[in-house]
């Protein structure tokens, strides 16, 4: 029960971690600029996301523009780009292997295969949660180092934006998710009596587990 | 109408210390970074050193790390430069700098001093 | 230290053609670039920050480009007031240093 508690924790906080990712990746919070003119009546605050970039003006208009060219996009902006959309795939194959692997799921029969599939989609979730430290981590890296840089100017200096916070609950929650589901198979499943009992079984899920494993409302 | 005028070079002998002035006017000085560039006699630009606004960070290149102090008089306007353990190859024109707002890198520069390093 | 390669050293062209300085930096800094004017007996004056972006009052002939650590100076049609020495010069890591220059003379 322990090791079922375990893994429908993990793959809870992986879903939100999944979550967290792709509105980060889609807000267009990820560098924020608080650019205050000679009078207040022009102050605004602007947004930068990787795909679009808004204006917020001290009225409370605010004004989007999606970026026009992918090739006229800096290097870095593109491939933030690409590891988020690969680190949001990649979450979503290790929740289709876990559902594979699951307890509460009959697409796999054999605990020893069961097992291995949870523990492989542990190793993609961690996988897609170093995925998504890595953009989120360069930004921030690229803001702080401008913002002690004495050569750029005031304007062009950023702040850390809502979107990199995002990231990083994202890329935690994705990282302990996963590992919550490696840890719940350290040895492939194979331990106890169970696993001696289910090879010289014909009818192996119904020795191998009790009926308490398998509450009927969970089935898949 | 941003003016930066250099004082205090000269000729100094090697291992001599000589203080470069900066007289700011046209903007408000406690605002903005300041730096110190220096162009040789084979027209080569090097950058000496840097203030930030308020004077509490300092950036210097390793070249003249250790002999060279910056400081400025956000008081006064001006900013200032310590030389000393003067080498032939500090031998340049020296030039006073104010960063920008809204510009990178060094954005006003002065008329400069010439400071020559010479027995 | 990043090293600033510029090239050429010195150039001549005629009223109305089309110049291209390049500098090259020796590792990354994204599009931490400048670029500076010295017009003759006179103090440098910034041109182009962050590699492509002109300040005020810099005629829009001047265009700046990056292509990974390769960066140039464009003026797209030769005037004789552009006479003067052009310097690249990095900001990305202390300590910021400046190309060798390029001497700019009309044919």
């Known amino acids: 029960m322990a090791s079922a508690g375990m893994q429908i924790l993990g793959v809870v906080l992986t879903l939100l971690g999944w979550v967290n990712g792709l509105v980060s990746c889609a807000l267009p919070m990820w560098k924020v600029t608080a650019f205050i003119g000679n009078s207040i009546v022009v102050a605004q605050v602007v947004w930068e996301g990787l795909w679009m970039s808004c204006v917020v003006q001290s009225t409370g208009q605010m004004q989007c523009k999606v970026y026009d060219s992918l090739l006229a996009l800096p290097q870095d902006l593109q491939a933030a780009r690409a590891l988020c959309v690969i680190a949001l795939l990649v979450a979503l194959f290790g929740l289709l292997v876990y559902l594979a692997g699951a307890k509460c799921t009959t697409c796999v029969e054999e605990k020893d295969s069961k097992a291995r599939l949870v523990l492989t989609s542990g190793i993609v979730f961690v996988i897609s949660g170093v995925l998504t430290l890595i953009p989120v981590c360069w930004t921030a890296h690229a803001i702080i180092r401008d913002f002690y840089n004495p050569l750029v100017a005031e304007a062009q200096k950023r702040e850390l934006g809502a979107s990199l916070y995002l990231g990083w609950a994202a890329s935690g929650l994705l990282l302990l998710g996963g590992g919550l589901l490696c840890c719940t198979c350290p040895s492939g499943g194979s331990q106890g009596p169970s696993h001696y009992m289910a090879r010289y079984s014909t009818s192996a899920p119904a020795i191998s587990r009790g009926p308490s494993e398998y509450p009927t409302k969970n089935y898949v | 109408e941003v003016k930066l005028v250099e004082s205090g070079g000269g000729l100094v002998k090697p291992g001599g210390s000589l203080r470069l002035s900066c007289a700011a006017s046209g903007f408000t000085f406690n605002s903005y970074t300041m730096s110190w560039v220096r162009q040789t006699p084979a027209k080569r630009l090097e950058w000496v050193v840097t203030i930030s606004s308020g004077g509490g960070r300092t950036y210097y290149p390793d070249s003249v790390k250790g002999r060279f102090t910056i400081s400025r008089d956000n008081a006064r306007n001006t900013l200032y430069l310590q030389m000393s353990s003067l080498r032939a190859e500090d031998t340049a024109v020296y030039y006073c700098?104010?960063?920008?707002?809204?510009?990178?890198?060094?954005?006003?520069w002065g008329q400069g001093t010439l400071v020559t390093v010479s027995s | 230290d990043i090293q600033m390669t510029q090239s050429p050293s010195s150039l001549s062209a005629s009223v109305g053609d089309r110049v291209t300085i390049t500098c090259r930096a020796s590792e990354n800094i994204d599009s931490y670039l400048a670029w500076y004017q010295q017009k003759p007996g006179k103090s440098p004056q910034l041109l182009v920050y962050?590699?492509?972006l002109l300040v005020d009052g810099v005629p829009s002939r001047f265009s700046g480009s990056r292509s990974g650590t390769q960066f140039s100076l464009t003026i797209s049609s030769l005037q004789p007031e552009d006479v003067a020495r052009y310097y690249c010069q990095h900001y990305y890591s202390i300590p910021y240093t400046f190309g060798s220059g390029t001497k700019l003379e009309i044919k």
């Open positions: 700098i104010r960063g920008d707002y809204r510009y990178d890198g060094f954005a006003y």
């Open positions: 962050a590699s492509t």
